[in-house]
């Protein structure tokens, strides 16, 4: 059986849309599948790598690598998207390409970044972890760390940094898929909203779905003990 909820929810483009949330109901009138997984049910993607989920994560990452920051021209906000999802007339798509990116580092002026920009994250304005010395962030945004401390400056002069961010990673469904969404949409979809991150590649959704003890390597499920828990 399915339980369908419909609600007007604030979406990425800053407008309210009618959204459906379909929940698979427990035939035995008990906890939901998400709750059961959290309680230690035998859910194979939490025990060992699931090829289908792995493919999904890789596909999400490939898309994210090509994403940019979509900044609304009316200063209403910005969100990480694909170029096709960013209005050509109402927004500006900030994407480093054709030598428009910053240098990799102040010591390496000639090599320019081509991966990015990322809404509210930039190697030039992140103090912790700083992109410098032996720890220069790679030219692949899907390998960027979460910035835990921004440089103390009200404005940077960069469109993708001075905008109000409207979406962050949200882990939705038992498949551990991730979307950049508004908090409202994420909560309505019963997802896990990552306030601290800017990109889906910075969060490990399956780890969140499975709960219990975190995976030793966030990318490799290792909860073999589930076999004895349930």
């Amino acid at each position: 059986a399915q339980h369908v909820t419909t609600q007007l929810v604030l979406r990425n483009k800053g407008v309210y849309e009618s959204v459906k949330y379909i929940q698979q109901e427990n035939f035995w009138i008990g906890p939901s599948s998400i709750d059961l997984i959290h309680l230690g049910a035998k859910f194979s993607p939490c025990i060992r790598k699931d090829q289908q989920i792995e493919q999904l994560v890789l596909r999400e990452r490939d898309l994210e690598r090509d994403s940019g920051c979509c900044v609304q021209n009316d200063h209403s906000g910005c969100i990480q998207t694909q170029r096709k999802d960013c209005s050509e007339t109402l927004a500006t798509f900030v994407k480093w390409q054709d030598d428009t990116g910053p240098p990799m580092d102040k010591s390496d002026l000639g090599q320019k970044r081509t991966s990015g920009a990322v809404c509210h994250q930039d190697p030039r304005t992140c103090e912790e972890p700083a992109s410098s010395g032996a720890h220069i962030w790679p030219d692949d945004i899907t390998k960027w760390p979460i910035c835990t401390e921004q440089a103390k400056s009200n404005r940077t002069g960069f469109l993708h940094m001075d905008c109000q961010i409207k979406g962050r990673p949200c882990c939705i469904s038992t498949k551990g898929s991730c979307e950049i969404t508004t908090r409202e949409y994420c909560e309505f979809m019963h997802g896990y909203f990552h306030e601290e991150a800017t990109l889906c590649s910075q969060v490990h959704c399956l780890d969140k779905v499975c709960g219990l003890l975190p995976f030793l390597n966030p990318e490799v499920p290792d909860q073999f003990y589930r076999l004895w828990l349930s």
């Epitope: 030598d99 428009t100 990116g101 910053p102 240098p103 102040k106 010591s107 002026l109 000639g110 320019k112 030039r124 304005t125 103090e127 700083a130 410098s132 440089a151 103390k152 404005r155 940077t156 002069g157 960069f158």
Partner: antibody, heavy 123, light 106 residues
């Protein structure tokens, strides 16, 4: 308001060491991303970049002069220093220090300059 | 090192006249920076990243170019624009400046 002021010996002899100080206010060199550089200008001539130093103590020198240059900072006193050893009469110039900015820029630029200090190298 | 050649070395213009000066790099650079120095004063940043006006710079100034060829334009010359203009690159160490273009008031 950001200001920088250079000070030096005014006059010195060839082969001596030139010591320059740049005292600044309105910003701190301990702030992430901040930098200050030295540029000189012989009378009625063009500008020549000498060196610059960053908040994280990263230092960059003009390779043509590198063996004779030393840049350093005293963050607590809001000062940077430049030493040039074994000076020559051709190094008579106005020496400027300048803050390095990058507001809205993919690279950096010298956004605020000091008034300069005139140094004469003469025997 | 990248050599920046500015031309002309000296030029003059009447008030209201359009002025264009060029800066040619010995090898390709991503961006050009322009500074203005009036007699007896320190240099002042005019343009960064080739075409962006620095804070407080009048809109009659504009910059353009790419690769090895860059230019600075003053749409309508004013008396206070009489100065020496320097281009600068931040593409490769050592950082280098052009020899300057001296703009005089006719």
């Amino acid at each position: 308001q950001v200001t920088l002021k250079e000070s030096g010996p005014g006059i010195l002899q060839p082969s001596q060491t030139l010591s320059l100080t740049c005292s600044f206010s309105g910003f701190s060199l301990s702030t992430f991303g901040m930098g200050v550089g030295w540029i000189r200008q012989p009378s009625e001539k063009g500008l020549e970049w000498l060196a610059h130093i960053w908040w994280d103590d990263d230092k960059y020198y003009n390779p043509a002069l590198k063996s004779r240059l030393t840049i350093s900072k005293d963050t607590s006193k809001n000062q940077i220093f430049l030493k040039i050893t074994n000076v020559d009469t051709a190094e008579t110039a106005t020496y400027y220090c300048s803050r390095i900015g990058n507001y809205g820029s993919n690279y950096w630029y010298f956004d605020v300059w000091g008034t300069g200090t005139t140094v004469t190298v003469s025997s | 090192q990248i050599v920046l050649t500015q031309s002309p070395a000296v030029m003059s213009a009447s008030p209201g006249e359009k002025v264009t000066m060029t800066c040619t790099a010995s090898s390709s650079v991503y961006y050009m920076y322009w500074y203005q120095q009036t007699p007896g004063s320190s240099p002042r940043l005019l343009i960064y990243d080739t075409s962006n006006l620095a804070s407080g710079v009048p809109v009659r100034f504009s910059g353009s170019g790419s690769g090895t060829s860059y230019s600075l334009t003053i749409s309508r010359m004013e008396a206070e624009d009489a100065a020496t203009y320097y281009c600068q690159q931040w593409n490769t160490y050592p950082l280098t400046f052009g020899a300057g273009t001296k703009l005089e008031l006719k």
